[in-house]
């Protein structure tokens, strides 16, 4: 690595990043025929343009605006599932409940999920060695700004009843510093969203506590209520059974509490 190259605290750009984004885009348009006319090369060009040749600590939402022009994908606004610190279960759920969507079920979310990327100021190079860490280096880095931008737009698009899956095994079930707590909660539109329904996912087999009474959930309820949106909360005591019952709702064991 040349001595002059900036060393950041976070991992570098995911290997084969351009190829991965392009391949994901093509795959997405094949899986979702309503996006069949999307030109993935143009999508990659816009994605690249957001961060290439720019200082990776000086990225703004404005940098992503050309790419966001593609974000007019019509996800049913009343079928949105948000999540915080429990991505895998949220994705397993929408894979079964095909008419509900997480951010990662949209094209832009699908393209970037689990990837890291950054460039270097004044060069067209992608930095595969290191990228800024949100805490140790800077918050205005390409990855953080991307997720903040798409998360805000996703929340703004939501209507009627919005669901959020929360991890009941964490010390802060609702974390104000998470993307959900810092971005999505504040961008739900009260004139469109009637209710936020939280699903608190229990971790332990024998955990029968009512986690909807957790202080952080009460804090979430307070924030939501102040925004003139109703709040409701459900405990999901057995996530494995919960998923099984989404798959087979007729199962006799699915009438009891899950």
């Amino acid at each position: 690595v040349p001595r002059w190259r900036q060393q950041w605290s976070g991992p570098g750009t995911t290997k084969r990043f351009p190829e991965t984004v392009l391949a994901r885009c093509v795959k997405y348009t094949e899986i979702h025929p309503e996006m069949r006319h999307v030109d993935c090369q143009s999508v990659w060009d816009a994605f690249k343009g957001a961060f290439i040749s720019k200082h990776p600590c000086n990225i703004t939402e404005e940098d992503y605006q050309p790419l966001m022009k593609l974000g007019t994908q019509t996800v049913p606004c009343n079928k949105i599932l948000l999540w915080s610190r429990i991505k895998d279960l949220a994705h397993q759920f929408t894979q079964v409940q095909r008419d509900m969507f997480t951010l990662e079920d949209t094209l832009l979310g699908y393209l970037a999920d689990d990837l890291t990327w950054c460039g270097e100021f004044n060069t067209s190079k992608i930095n595969y060695q290191s990228c800024p860490d949100w805490r140790k280096d800077c918050s205005n880095n390409p990855v953080s700004v991307f997720w903040k931008t798409v998360s805000r737009r996703f929340a703004e698009a939501a209507c009627d009843v919005v669901h959020v899956m929360l991890n009941g095994s964490r010390s802060k079930i609702f974390d104000k510093n998470s993307t959900f707590g810092s971005v999505e909660v504040h961008n739900l539109q009260p004139e469109k969203v009637q209710t936020l329904e939280a699903w608190v996912i229990h971790g332990g087999r024998e955990d029968s506590r009512d986690l909807c009474q957790d202080p952080t959930i009460k804090e979430l309820e307070s924030i939501i209520s102040k925004r003139n949106i109703q709040f409701s909360c459900k405990n999901i005591y057995r996530p494995d059974k919960f998923l099984q019952c989404v798959k087979n709702p007729e199962d006799s064991s699915c009438t009891s509490e899950i």
Partner: antibody, heavy 118, light 110 residues
């Protein structure tokens, strides 16, 4: 080979209704998006409506939304366009077209003429 | 007024090269494939170019398509008398949730 044959065109008064049909053969009809495209006399091509494969989703041009309904019957290999509240400006040759996977209209019928006049 | 802008006419002598432009915006050409159709009066339109620059089988390689940003173009090299027709560009438009066609360009072989 692919064949698309439109029918149902004719002369109708303003405010009247007409139903166009398109009989498809030579491909797996249920797999493909289908569309209606029109050309008014002396004008260019104008997309009217599309219907998806599978559980049908429909798409309409602003100029016809609320008045026209596109539908399909996969069992009969047929595409339809129900046209209500017809206006003089709907006068055109209406083409039925098959969409391929990239969104292109690969195959077209010969068209059926709709004339809206009092 | 078409969403995609094309010149109304283009002409050239036999054997010449003619280029037709098609200008749009980020909501159509910018992020979506461009298609070109040839239309002879009294016949069904014919697909010439799909996915910006791909030719269906049977379309001569004299026809080529390209796209850059929010614009696209169709080039016809070695112009022949049978190329006299109307040519339309088309693309999906996100803001309209539907396809849009250009106003059409009439190509004349002098």
């Amino acid at each position: 080979q692919v064949q698309l044959v439109e029918s149902g065109g004719g002369l109708v008064k303003p405010g009247g209704s007409l139903r166009l049909s398109c009989a498809a053969s030579g491909f797996t009809f249920s797999d493909d998006y289908m569309s209606w495209i029109r050309q008014a006399p002396g004008k260019g091509l104008e997309w009217v409506a599309s219907v998806s494969s599978g559980r049908p989703t429909t798409y309409y041009a602003d100029s016809v939304r609320g008045r026209f309904t596109i539908s399909r019957d996969n069992a009969k290999n047929s595409l339809y366009l129900q046209m209500n509240s017809l206006r003089a400006e709907d006068t055109a040759v209406y083409y039925c077209a098959r969409e391929d996977w990239g969104g292109e209209f690969t195959d077209w019928g010969q068209g059926t003429l709709v004339t809206v006049s009092s | 007024q078409s969403v995609l802008t094309q010149p109304p006419s283009a002409s050239g002598t036999s054997g010449q090269r003619v280029t037709i432009s098609c200008s749009g915006s980020s909501s159509n050409i910018g992020f979506h494939f461009v298609y070109w159709y040839q239309h002879l009066p009294g016949t069904a339109p014919k697909l010439l170019i799909y996915k910006n620059n791909q030719r269906p089988s049977g379309v001569p390689d004299r026809f080529s398509g390209s796209k850059s940003g929010n614009s696209a173009s169709l080039a016809i090299s070695g112009l022949r008398s049978e190329d006299e027709a109307d040519y339309y560009c088309a693309a999906w438009d996100d803001s309209l949730s539907g396809y849009v066609f250009g106003s059409g360009t009439k190509v004349t072989v002098l």
